[in-house]
């Protein structure tokens, strides 16, 4: 069964996934799909590495983790209830059927309306500004919510404040994590 | 293996367009990647210019937006460079190149020299 | 616009040498960057991406270091085939990415 991994509409999602490479920067291919994992490759790929980088990819969907120290966990930005579902994250381990494969299932809850304290409501507050910050392809803009422009060498940082630690602790804990080589 | 080569006119006159086309084998520009036009001045210096990701979308140098078009053919597997009222600024030898999520190159063309002048 | 600055235009090397191409950038890239070699009449090769990934098929004399601003590509015992012009590039900010303004290496 899949392990379960929960968040709010308009907020990031955080789906982890990791191995251990043979040696840093010496990479196995990963795909990410929405829908659990097929015999082979990913269905319906969100994002996909090759043996050095990001190749494919949409818009809101990022590895932010050190991915090539292992850790592909998948972020997604600014997630709808459409968003909910089961996520497949596939390690391509070269050799016949050698392909580690895990499957997330993914809850969006609806987000927590707070009522206002007075009849007059405070816009700003209800309401942050939303600003574009820069993410791992030129010109994509990814909304972190009401925050200052960020660059690359932020997101990591940023990413790891956003994610829940419980969860990526519950899929080291469940044996999610791999080792190559 | 992947390969690139760029094709167009070498000279061409100021107030006039250039276009240039790259042509892509060994994979296909729909597939994934960044691809991309830099170009190399006399000089050296190198400026990149904007890229097509393989899903259509574009971008570009702020420096050039006004001026500069990048648009693909996927059925030839090509895609192309428009710089609109170029002038001898724009000699230079273009570049059509692959790129990552993160836009550095892994494979480049072999460049053609365009010379802009009367 | 991020800069990026190789002060040595030149650098003289021998044979066997172990030569240091520097880069600095005007603020802080991470370790989004990239080397590249160019020789003449040549396009870029790549030969390091992430400031410290060798890029396949690129001799293990050559090394990439760095973080933030400061990176240098190293080249251990020069062959004569490296006699080259070297780039650096950021890739850390959108839309542009900016290359350095290179680095010729020449025989003493």
């Known amino acids: 069964s899949e392990v379960e991994y929960r968040a709010e509409v308009g907020q990031n999602a955080y789906l982890p996934c990791f191995y251990t490479p043979a040696a840093p920067g010496n990479l196995v291919p990963v795909c990410w799909g929405k829908g659990a994992c097929p015999v082979f490759e990913c269905g319906n790929v969100v994002l996909r590495t090759d043996e050095r980088d990001v190749n494919y990819w949409t818009s809101r969907y990022w590895l932010n983790g050190d991915f090539r120290k292992g850790d592909v966990s998948l972020t997604i930005e600014n997630v709808t209830l459409a968003d909910s579902g089961i996520y497949c994250c596939r390690i391509q381990i070269p050799g016949i059927m050698n392909d580690e494969k895990f499957n997330l299932k993914l809850v969006i809850k609806p987000a927590k309306v707070t009522p206002a304290p007075t009849r007059q409501r405070d816009f700003t507050a209800a309401f942050p500004r939303m600003l574009t910050t820069r993410g791992h392809g030129p010109a994509e803009t990814q909304t972190l919510g009401s925050l200052p422009d960020i660059n690359l060498t932020q997101i990591s940082t940023l990413a790891n404040e956003l994610r829940d630690s419980r969860l990526a602790n519950d899929l080291r804990d469940s044996g999610a994590t791999i080792r190559i080589g | 293996d992947v390969q690139l080569q760029e094709s167009g006119p070498d000279l061409v006159k100021p107030s006039q367009s250039l276009s240039l086309t790259c042509t892509v084998t060994g994979y296909s520009i729909t597939s994934g990647y960044s691809w991309h036009w830099i170009r190399q001045f006399p000089g050296n210096k190198l400026e990149w210019m904007g890229y097509i990701y393989f899903s259509g979308s574009t971008n570009y140098n702020p420096s050039l937006k006004s001026r500069i078009s990048i648009t693909r053919d996927t059925s030839k597997n090509q895609f192309f460079l428009q710089l609109n009222s170029v002038t001898t600024e724009d000699t230079a030898t273009y570049y059509c190149?692959?790129?990552?999520?993160?836009?550095?190159?892994?494979?480049w063309g072999q460049g053609t020299l365009v010379t802009v002048s009367a | 616009d991020i800069v990026m600055t190789q002060s040595q235009k030149f650098m003289s090397t021998s044979v066997g040498d172990r030569v240091s191409v520097t880069c600095k950038a005007s603020?802080?890239?991470?370790?989004?960057v990239a080397w590249y070699q160019q020789k003449p009449g040549q396009s870029p090769k790549t030969l390091i991406y992430s400031a410290s990934y060798r890029y396949s098929g690129v001799p293990d004399r050559f090394t990439g270091s760095g973080s933030g601003t400061d990176f240098t590509l190293t080249i251990s015992n020069v062959q004569s085939e490296d006699l080259a012009e070297y780039f650096c590039?950021?890739?850390?900010?959108?839309?542009?990415?900016?290359f350095g303004t290179g680095t010729k290496l020449e025989l003493k």
């Open positions: 590039q950021q890739y850390n900010s959108y839309p542009l990415v900016t």
């Open positions: 603020q802080n890239v991470g370790t989004n």
């Open positions: 190149a692959r790129g990552y999520r993160s836009a550095w190159f892994a494979y």
